[in-house]
Interface confidence: low
């Protein structure tokens, strides 16, 4: 015997209170597949979120972040403040990268300059807060470990997971 609910299309739900007839999803809710017994509540985009795609009866709303913030996490589950290149975000706000580190993006953390000597190379262009050093070929008589800026800390990857 076929389940009568299987005939209910996306955008409706199988209403047990009305002899399992297909009722449209109420306002601010949706069902993205057929045969659903309830509709899901639409996501709201509040605070530093803004609406990227409105909710419809068949698909959820999608949020992104207001200017000055960027998404973190699957489906933009939270927003993190942008900083300038050469800065990283702390709880007190955006702070300049310490000497020996750089950040070439508006997000993430300051990372140590490349240690050219580890590859037997010399520093061709010095690093800045915004840019990594540029390594060049080893100069004559160069021995690894003699011509480089030592990074102050190991590199770390910025977090991009749900809060």
């Amino acid at each position: 015997l076929q389940d009568p609910c299987s005939n209910c299309p996306a955008g409706t739900f199988c209403d047990n209170n009305r002899n399992q007839i297909c009722s449209p999803c109420p306002p601010n809710s949706f069902s993205s597949a057929g045969g659903q017994r309830t509709c899901d509540i639409c996501r709201q985009c509040k605070g530093v979120f803004r609406t990227r795609k409105e909710c419809s009866s068949t698909s959820n709303a999608e949020c992104d972040c207001t200017p000055g913030f960027h998404c973190l996490g699957a489906g933009c589950s939270m927003c993190e403040q942008d900083c300038k290149q050469g800065q990283e975000l702390t709880k007190k706000g955006c702070k300049d990268c310490c000497f020996g580190t750089f950040n070439d993006q508006k997000r993430g953390i300051c990372r140590p300059w490349t240690n050219c000597s580890l590859d037997g190379k010399s520093v061709l262009v010095n690093g800045t807060k915004e840019r990594d050093v540029v390594c060049g070929p080893a100069s004559a008589g160069f021995s690894p470990g003699t011509s480089s800026v030592t990074p102050p800390a190991p590199a770390r990857e910025p977090g991009h997971s749900p809060q």
Epitope: I41, R43, Q44, K46, G47, V48, F49, C63, C65, F69, L72, G73, A74, G75, S77, M78, C79, E80, Q81, L89, K91, I109, R156, E157, P158, G159, H160, S161, P162, Q163
Partner: antibody, heavy 118, light 107 residues
Framework: QVQLVESGGGLVQPGGSLRLSCAAS????????MHWVRQAPGKGLEWVSV????????YYADSVKGRFTISRDNSKNTLYLQMNSLRAEDTAVYYC???????????WGQGTLVTVSS | DIELTQPPSVSVAPGQTARISCSGD??????VSWYQQKPGQAPVLVIY???ERPSGIPERFSGSNSGNTATLTISGTQAEDEADYYC??????????FGGGTKLTVL
């Protein structure tokens, strides 16, 4: 199912240190920001700190900044809170929590009591 | 950070409706969650995203949020609802803010 189990609480003298641990299970630990929230005896909830899934980003309440350090070991599914220069006002039950963020439910541990007293 | 203000206590007769307020500057533009906490237990989420109920939370719990006030409403209050209730505000960014808590007494 999701489980968070705190440990490491106890009695410590003012100025002392303590490290709390929170063992997580039942979900992909490294996918989630994790929080510490505390509650002084007879008082309300106070957010303390949060750490990103990879451990690279950390944030603190002003009341603990410079004294507490949040960290995690994703290979052990464990969250930590290193507490230094402890004060009497840090006496509280400390909860490890995965707090709601749009799509995921809230999960809290049962808490571990930290008492700072001479 | 926003400061959230709750009444220290609210009393209600069994079967009646309890309303607990949470005030904060333009709180309606932020997400509000509500927690129930019974003595010696961890907090339990009862409302999230202003008005959504997690699975397992009775239908008598509902929430609203607009302007400068969010409200937790418990219709047909039962003795087992006696607990402390905390609001929490979140604007989508990193840190969280909790209200001071309200002790609900069922007379």
């Amino acid at each position: 199912q999701v489980q968070l189990v705190e440990s490491g609480g106890g009695l410590v003298q003012p100025g002392g240190s303590l490290r709390l641990s929170c063992a997580a299970s039942g979900f992909t630990f490294s996918d989630y920001y994790m929080h510490w929230v505390r509650q002084a005896p007879g008082k309300g909830l106070e957010w303390v700190s949060v750490i990103s899934g990879s451990g690279s980003n950390t944030y603190y309440a002003d009341s603990v900044k410079g004294r507490f350090t949040i960290s995690r070991d994703n290979s052990k599914n464990t969250l930590y809170l290193q507490m230094n220069s402890l004060r009497a006002e840090d006496t509280a039950v400390y909860y490890c929590a995965r707090l709601y963020a749009q799509f995921e439910g809230d999960f809290w541990g049962q808490g571990t009591l930290v008492t700072v007293s001479s | 950070d926003i400061e959230l203000t709750q009444p220290p206590s609210v009393s209600v007769a069994p079967g009646q409706t309890a309303r607990i307020s949470c005030s904060g500057d333009n709180i309606g533009s932020k997400y509000v969650s509500w927690y129930q906490q019974k003595p010696g237990q961890a907090p339990v989420l009862v409302i999230y995203s202003d008005s959504e109920r997690p699975s397992g939370i009775p239908e008598r719990f509902s929430g609203s949020n607009s302007g400068n006030t969010a409200t937790l409403t418990i219709s047909g209050t039962q003795a087992e609802d006696e607990a402390d209730y905390y609001c929490q505000s979140w604007d989508g960014s990193i840190s969280r803010v909790f209200g001071g808590g309200t002790k609900l007494t069922v007379l």
